[in-house]
């Protein structure tokens, strides 16, 4: 099914406009901003979601040390260019003709340049490290229970195949979720780790992208897991190319 048939809405993306104008009167949904048709049985790509967001009214155990090549999304929101499949185009430019290259999750991986900047290919982000700090609790969560609960969440809520959740680390109050997905591992129909991480990030911030589903209520054996800080690191299959001046 492409969308909820009974009331013609998109369960996996509330930033859509839906109408029963598909083949045979089927419900069809299009993303705001781009007008692209979306498959409502799975997550919408981060690129289309960012584009929709920019078009919306403007109201309102041993922990992993990220590698030297890990990227953090410091640039924040921008209005991206998406390809016909909804993926980020390798080169992104703003209205003032400033351009840069991005990875498959839309995070800048080069210095900014002008229109002559070339981005030969969209470099895949194959490893995502989600770093969370939870609010104080009476005691530490049981590691195995926490691990299982987060794996269940990514399977059930985001439809991410269990093989892509590489590890869950916990050193109270820090939780780290490692997602890994090489190009060769990702089969047709598999949810992309970048999309799953983005939905999770928005859920954690209380900005759920799901239609008609309650917000994220994370519990470990009934004990609420409340996140007070999130940092996401992105590792690409090819290391990013920044000049030394950025590092100083």
């Amino acid at each position: 099914h492409t969308a909820a048939q009974d009331n013609c809405t998109c369960p996996t993306n509330k930033m859509t406009v839906c109408s029963p104008d598909g083949p045979g009167g089927r419900c069809q949904c299009r993303a705001l901003g781009s007008g692209m048709a979306v498959d409502c049985s799975t997550l919408t790509s981060k690129c289309l979601l960012l584009k929709a967001r920019m078009s919306a009214p403007k109201n309102a155990r041993t922990l992993v040390r990220p590698s030297e090549h890990a990227l953090v999304d410091n640039d924040g929101l921008y209005d991206p260019d998406c390809d016909p499949e909804g993926r980020f185009k390798a080169r992104q430019c703003n209205q003032t003709s400033v351009c840069w290259c991005v990875n498959s999750v839309g995070v800048r991986r080069t210095d900014k340049g002008d229109l002559s900047l070339r981005c030969d290919e969209l470099v895949r982000t194959h490893h995502i490290l989600i770093d969370l700090r939870h609010r104080p609790t009476a005691g530490a969560f049981n590691h195995s229970d926490l691990d299982a609960e987060l794996r269940r969440l990514f399977r059930e809520r985001y439809r991410l195949h269990p093989k892509f959740v590489a590890a869950v680390h916990y050193e109270q109050p820090t939780i780290q979720i490692e997602l890994r997905q090489n190009t060769s591992q990702k089969a047709a129909g598999d949810v992309d780790i970048g999309d799953a991480a983005y939905y999770f990030e928005r859920d954690i911030k209380g900005e759920s992208l799901f239609q008609g589903r309650g917000g994220l209520d994370l519990r470990v054996r009934g004990e609420p897991l409340q996140v007070e800080r999130t940092l996401i690191y992105y590792l690409d299959e090819i290391p990013p190319k920044f000049s030394m001046k950025r590092l100083t």
Epitope: H1, S144, A148, R151, R152, E156, L160, H161, P162, A167
Partner: antibody, heavy 117, light 106 residues
Framework: EVQLVQSGPEVKKPGASVKVSCKAS????????IGWVRQAPGQGLEWIGE????????YYTQKFKGRVTMTADTSTSTAYMELSSLRSEDTAVYYC??????????WGQGTLVTVSS | DIQLTQSPSSLSASVGDRVTITCSAS?????MYWYQQKPGKAPKLLIY???TLASGVPSRFSGSGSGTDFTLTISSLQPEDFATYYC?????????FGQGTKLEIK
Amino acid sequence: EVQLVQSGPEVKKPGASVKVSCKASGFTFTDYVIGWVRQAPGQGLEWIGEIYLGSGTIYYTQKFKGRVTMTADTSTSTAYMELSSLRSEDTAVYYCARGSIFPFDYWGQGTLVTVSS
Amino acid sequence: DIQLTQSPSSLSASVGDRVTITCSASSSVSYMYWYQQKPGKAPKLLIYDTSTLASGVPSRFSGSGSGTDFTLTISSLQPEDFATYYCQQWSSYPYTFGQGTKLEIK
């Protein structure tokens, strides 16, 4: 073809332990989850817990915690569920089932465990 | 724990009848799953994500609902449909099943 083949029926005395095996074929074992469900005679389905085969992460329901142990041998693509301190109420058919982005997509044929003095 | 209550617990119907089984959850769930079980056999996945038919399942089966109320419908009963049906949720641990609905020949 995805297959889950379980071990044969068992008869145990109260207080004993039983270990049920579930041999998988037709898929990459460590990419999936194996859940365990039981069904007492003439009754409904009851979930026991699950094991993530790649990481060894396990979740048991509170009812069985302390009495159940789930393990996996990746070299033989076999999952195991051991239940200890058996009582007559544990008489049931025990099923293993594969989990992916669905909770249970393929099921084993079931193993009847009879607890009787 | 989320309790699932199926209605009715048993049902007698004839070939060709339209049959509806409901499943009510004690708190809101994202999706419902339905299984069919025949005597002496393992359950078989029938419907996932509330309304999507599993591979090989005939189109006479359909599922609907949201939140706490879900429905399984068989539009025209066939002889092979007489079995027990279970709903199941996994929106939170522990996964739970309904008590089952036994569909018998009238």
